[in-house]
């Protein structure tokens, strides 16, 4: 329809239009995570805050149980960030040692699960060596990017230690997801 | 209106729809930044390039003072990236010494402040301890989500420390909005 | 039009509008890279995979020899992630053979060429010191902006070491842009 | 539901060693940090060290290298090793498990003395 | 290491007082500070987290406070099951270390 006079004589069925305003947003915020069981072979969900403060949910995206569920198909812009916190990594001494020297790390994964899929679907990976010299690390690992989802996908956020997430601000941690 | 002709007949009033190249949009880069005044317990803002080069705004979106000023309510894209440059971190050395091990730390922060409410607000905090082992160092920290935002609402971007950062090109410190 | 009506009598003719399902988008994923020529003073450019898995071309933007190439001109998001891995950094040694410490480093650029522009220009750069303590050592770069481009405008994605590119999944190196 | 079981307490002589053992249930091991704590006959508790979700190890410098921390996924138990012990490390010995600044959930406790 | 600074070490009180107790660390601790109940033979249980956050399942009278080195637990309103063995612990820094405690017992 670009640049295209909207005249009243003719009945032609237009691509789909939409306000941009009724589209599916969400923006999630961290909360303290707690111990929970989860699948074999697959890093642990975290949960969110999805109404206080800076976090929201509107136009049919909803959140429930740690994932966020897409209402309509189409192509999403989705992102995370995760901020991780620990202590000394034991990483100098045990290269010190001799001993085998795989790193320790800290991972977070965006992963998409459809019903009719049996996997889930890796769709964002960030994954770090942390080998810190200081007694105290922090960092964060920021993804985003766009993907074509079905109505009926459900996205959460994996990480690979859940007690190791900075849960204190919620500008530290957060998930989103909008249809563009 | 998704799938829905334009019939003559009725004069419904739709949805608002609106053409995408007339929505406010930012971009600006990074410059040389001076020492000023900050308020107390909050990090510096930066200052930054609004129309040389990559840097624009268009479409009622302006940059004054430190702050890009949202013209229209509505959800939001914001993003960042700045990237920081240094010299050797003491960190090893205090650790070595026994003296207490708080690490140094690059922080990012991008804050709203709205006029009728005293306290800015962070939307964003990238933060991460450096500890590093080689005499110069350097990295960014990545930003962006997407916020529900007020007209008059102002952005800006916050560092913890002003003189850390590179100011040398404008592909490696930046800062956006776009109205989705 | 926001929050006007369509009524039949006029034949204005108003702001473009489009169908956001027609705009032009891609998002590209890793492949095991070859090494190849590039030009002098240019880091190497990355090439893609842009049909299987999670990566898509669609609405004429399409990917041809390492380039998306620009169907249309307008303001789009470009972002990309890669993930590198490498061993050792000699960085410490260096340091402590007291020769001069420029430390190893690992560099992103987002690039836009336009034909009828001799030098390429870079749009997003993302770099970082490496100087690790591990014998092994992996992190992911993140970039993300937007920008005017050009129909006919080429992107593309140039790192500064193609051999530390960690290739071997399609969520940890990744490429896209999408009109906004 | 998160639980943690301590067990392998008992007697044991001035300078021999000990294994207990933390069996948890309601998470992953390799996802979650379990701590150890101590806390002597009528005085505080003592932190002795931590198994990070991703394997790594800390230590409270105090204990001189004597307590090791380990763990089995298998059976998703943690263990605490303790090796040439002392009078002063009888203690009712804890595991928990939580964040990576607080312990949110604990188990009851088993006893340790040493005496000859 | 970080000291952590308990008072008092013991308190008497009634059912509906109000009951304040502090823990003072011999440095920052960014908030990090964290306040357990200990009772008879029962495990450990997590009131508060990062000063001033309840644990789930925790009543609202429970209330965290401080900054710094200073920090304070209160409880709004006693009720019988408080009487029991309280520590704070600071989260910031290795070693994780405790105050002492503070007893509360039925005046």
């Known amino acids: 329809l670009k640049g295209q006079e909207f005249a009243p004589s003719h009945q032609q069925v237009y691509a789909p239009l939409r306000a941009d305003g009724d589209k599916p947003r969400a923006h999630l915020t961290v909360v303290r995570q707690t111990p929970t069981q989860h699948f074999k072979n697959q890093f642990p969900a975290l949960h969110w805050e999805h109404e206080l403060g800076l976090a929201f949910t509107k136009n049919r995206m909803n959140y429930t149980n740690k994932f966020l569920l897409i209402p309509e198909s189409g192509d999403y812009f989705i992102y995370s960030q995760v901020t991780f916190r620990g202590m000394t990594s034991e990483c100098s001494e045990i290269r010190q040692a001799g001993r085998p020297n795989k790193p320790d790390s800290i991972t977070v994964v965006i992963t998409k699960v459809t019903d009719s899929y049996p996997e889930p679907t890796q769709l964002l990976m960030g994954t770090k060596s942390v080998c810190e010299v200081g007694s105290n690390w922090f960092q964060p690992i920021y993804l985003g990017a766009m993907f074509s989802l079905q109505e009926g996908d459900k996205l959460m956020v994996n990480v690979s230690d859940i007690s190791l997430v900075d849960y204190t601000k919620e500008d530290k941690t957060f998930f989103g997801a909008f249809l563009l | 209106l998704k799938g829905q002709e334009f019939a003559p007949s009725h004069q419904q009033v739709y949805a608002p729809l609106r053409a995408d190249g007339d929505k406010p949009r930012a971009h600006l880069t990074v410059v040389r930044q001076t020492p000023t005044q900050h308020f107390k317990n909050q990090f510096p803002a930066l200052h930054w390039e609004h129309e040389l080069g990559l840097a624009f705004t268009k479409n009622r979106m302006n940059y004054t003072n430190k702050f890009l000023l949202i013209p229209e309510s509505g959800d939001y894209f914001i993003y960042s990236q700045v990237t920081f440059r240094g010299m050797t971190s003491e960190c090893s050395e205090i650790r070595q010494a026994g003296r207490p091990n708080k690490p140094d730390s690059i922080t990012v922060v991008i804050t709203k402040v709205t006029d009728s409410y005293p306290e800015p607000t962070q939307l964003l905090m990238g933060t991460k301890s450096v500890c590093e082992v080689g005499s110069n160092w350097f990295q960014p920290i990545y930003l962006g989500a997407m916020f529900s935002l007020q007209e008059g609402d102002k952005l800006m971007v916050n560092v913890s420390d002003i003189s850390l950062v590179d100011y040398t090109k404008e592909d490696k410190t930046f800062f956006g909005a776009f109205l989705l | 039009l926001k929050g006007q009506e369509f009524a039949p009598s006029h034949q204005q003719v108003y702001a473009p509008l489009r169908a956001d399902g027609d705009k032009p988008r891609a998002h590209l994923t890793v492949v095991r890279q070859t090494p190849t020529q590039h030009f002098k003073n240019q880091f190497p450019a990355l090439h893609w995979e842009h049909e299987l898995g999670l990566a898509f071309t669609k609405n004429r933007m399409n990917y041809t020899n390492k380039f998306l190439l620009i169907p249309e001109s307008g303001d789009y998001f470009i972002y990309s992630q890669v993930t590198f891995r490498g061993m050792t950094s000699e960085c410490s040694e260096i340091r402590q053979a007291g020769r001069p410490n420029k430390p190893d480093s690992i560099t992103v650029v987002i690039t836009k060429v336009t034909d009828s522009y001799p030098e390429p220009t870079q749009l997003l750069m993302g770099t970082k010191s490496v100087c690790e303590v591990g014998s092994n050592w992996f992190q992911p770069i993140y970039l993300g902006a937007m920008f005017s481009l050009q129909e006919g405008d080429k992107l593309m994605v140039n790192v500064s070491d193609i051999s530390l590119v960690d290739y071997t999944k399609e969520d940890k190196t990744f490429f896209g842009a999408f009109l906004l | 539901e998160v639980q943690l079981l301590e067990s392998g307490g008992g007697l044991v002589q001035p300078g021999g060693s000990l294994r207990l053992s933390c069996a948890v249930s309601?998470?992953?091991?390799?996802?979650?940090?379990v701590d150890w704590v101590r806390q002597a006959p009528g005085k505080g508790l003592e932190w002795l060290g931590v198994?990070?979700?991703?394997?790594?190890?800390n230590y409270n410098s105090a204990l001189k290298s004597r307590f090791t921390i380990s763990r089995d996924n298998s059976k998703n138990t943690v263990y605490l090793q303790m090796n040439s012990l002392r009078a002063e490390d009888t203690a009712v010995y804890y595991c928990?498990?939580?964040?990576?600044?607080?312990?949110?959930?604990w188990g009851q406790g088993t006893l340790v003395t040493v005496s000859s | 290491d970080i000291q952590m600074t308990q008072s008092p070490s013991s308190l008497s009180a009634s059912v509906g007082d109000r009951v304040t107790i502090t823990c003072r660390a011999s440095q920052d601790i960014s908030n990090y500070l964290n306040w357990y109940q200990q009772k008879p033979g029962k495990a450990v249980k997590l009131l508060i987290y990062?000063?001033?956050r309840l644990h789930s399942g925790v009543p609202s009278r429970f209330s965290g406070s401080g900054s710094g080195t200073d920090y304070t637990l209160t409880i709004s309103s006693l009720q019988p099951e408080d009487f029991a063995t309280y520590f704070c612990q600071q989260g910031n820094t290795l070693p994780f270390t405790f105050g002492q405690g503070t007893k509360l017992e039925i005046k």
């Open positions: 198994i990070w979700g991703f394997g790594g190890t």
């Open positions: 928990a498990s939580g964040n990576f600044d607080a312990m949110d959930y």
């Open positions: 309601g998470f992953s091991l390799s996802s979650y940090g």
């Open positions: 990062y000063t001033s």
